[in-house]
């Protein structure tokens, strides 16, 4: 999805993108708070399709893991974050009910500011 | 999904999420980069379920659509920019070909920077 | 013999509503997706907008999306095109045709309704 | 997208010569193309797709030839009712015309 390094920009956080198959995720959080089991696979009309996300997160060993580049540091302490965001999802909850739930899955990676006090 | 604010956290870019039925969406961009038709409900074993998306971009009318918050301006332009992620959705292409689809829909709003040159 | 028989057209001002109908016969009008096709005054074709056999997928071109709706009534062989906030450009002899089979081509027209937007 | 581009824009020629009409593609569209005739005051008439197939009821005089980028309709022996506009189309992604070439007479 157009990479700012293209465009001669740089990211205030560092990110990564992977694709996560099911079999690796195995439970994750539904909209409701609960964890619920993420099947393998779906039932589409002609067999089954594999349950994959495409996931982004900030970047542990990014240069921006002590906090968010470019930001006035006289004012603000900062801190790059992993955000989340809801993808359907073919899910087992604990009741063994199987049906397609909203989950959380981590897709960006943002800045955080808090003010600086006592200067 | 864990609001920043309620810690006395900002976010470097201010940012909206809607959920947004296919009916509203109509068109997406697939992984190939052709467009698509996103169908409106998804056959279930049970009837049909409609098709939504939860949709995050940068606040258009938000503090930091003229760049973004906290940012060292002595030596960075800035600007918050509205980034996709892929997330399956049942389409039809132009081939009146129905199929599960990787889709592209913006998942979030993050800041890019250029160096500020000739100071 | 195929015909399609379009109506509806007329003049309106700029963001007004118009309601364009094609009425079929001599086929079999719930085995074939439909399509509206428009054509500027002295100007080529443009396809709008078309919607599948059994009426439950729609699609449309980038130019109207969000403001025109393609719909078909199976029992009364006649297909429909709301059209919303309706702008100067969207002028044009309006054409009802039938798709083929398996692609997005035309093999019957009607002979069209005017639609002129004009303050 | 996609763009079809139609060359000439005009072709004035006598009736029983030859036409050649032209449409470029913007990038490969395979054979997914149609052409169509226009007359004044009508609707289009389908006359081939795939490029080179012809329609149901549309004479043997007119042929569509080409792949990929570049396509050409010919009509061998133009009779009077041949002059007309006549329009490509590719289905190879979401429907797009070119912008025309008409055969006129001379």
């Known amino acids: 999805h157009s990479d700012p390094a293209r465009r001669g920009e740089l990211s205030v956080c560092d990110s990564i993108s992977e694709w996560v198959t099911a079999a690796d995720k195995k439970t994750a959080v539904d909209m409701s708070g609960g964890t619920v089991t993420v099947l393998e696979k779906v039932p589409v009309s002609k067999g089954q399709l594999k349950q994959y996300f495409y996931e982004t997160k900030c970047n542990p060993m990014g240069y921006t893991k002590e906090g968010c580049r470019g930001i006035d540091k006289r004012h603000w302490n900062s801190q790059c974050r992993t955000t989340q965001s809801y993808v359907r999802a073919l899910t087992m909850d604990s009741k063994k009910r199987i049906g397609w739930r909203f989950i959380r899955i981590d897709t960006s990676c943002v800045c955080t500011l808090t003010i600086k006090r006592g200067r | 999904h864990s609001d920043p604010a309620r810690r006395g956290e900002l976010s470097v870019c201010d940012s909206i999420s809607e959920w947004v039925t296919a009916a509203d969406k109509k068109t997406a961009v697939d992984m190939s980069g052709g467009t698509v038709t996103v169908l409106e409900k998804v056959p279930v074993s049970k009837g049909q379920l409609k098709q939504y998306f939860y949709e995050t971009k940068c606040n258009p009318m938000g503090y930091t659509k003229e760049g973004c918050r906290g940012i060292d301006k002595r030596h960075w332009n800035s600007q918050c920019r509205t980034t996709q992620s892929y997330v399956r959705a049942l389409t039809m292409d132009s081939k009146k070909r129905i199929g599960w689809r990787f889709i592209r829909i913006d998942t979030s709003c993050v800041c890019t920077l250029t160096i500020k040159r000739g100071r | 013999d195929v015909q399609l028989v379009e109506s509806g057209g007329g003049v309106v001002r700029p963001g007004e509503s118009l309601r364009l109908s094609c009425a079929a016969s001599g086929f079999t009008f719930d085995n074939y997706d439909m399509s509206w096709v428009r054509q500027a005054p002295g100007e080529g074709l443009e396809w709008v907008s078309g919607?599948?056999?059994?009426?439950?997928?729609?699609y449309y071109a980038d130019s109207v999306k969000g403001r025109f709706t393609i719909s078909r009534d199976n029992s009364k062989n006649t297909l429909h095109l709301q059209m919303n906030s309706l702008r100067a450009e969207d002028t044009a002899i309006y054409y009802c045709?039938?798709?083929?089979?398996?692609?997005?081509?035309?093999?019957?027209w009607g002979l069209g309704t005017l639609v002129t937007v004009s303050s | 997208e996609i763009v079809l581009t139609q060359s000439p824009g005009t072709l004035s020629l006598s009736p029983g010569e030859r036409a050649i009409l032209n449409c470029r593609a913007s990038?490969?569209?395979?054979?997914?193309l149609a052409w169509y005739q226009q007359k004044p005051g009508q609707a289009p008439r389908l006359l081939i797709y795939?490029?080179?197939t012809r329609a149901a009821g549309i004479p043997a005089r007119f042929r569509g030839s080409g792949s990929g980028t570049d396509f050409t309709l010919t009509i061998s022996r133009l009779e009077p009712e041949d002059f007309a506009v006549y329009y490509c189309q590719q289905y190879y992604d979401w429907p797009r015309f070119g912008g025309g070439t008409k055969v006129e007479i001379k």
């Open positions: 990038q490969n569209i395979d054979s997914d």
């Open positions: 795939g490029a080179n």
């Open positions: 919607i599948r056999e059994s009426g439950d997928i729609t």
């Open positions: 045709a039938r798709e083929t089979r398996k692609a997005i081509l035309f093999d019957y």
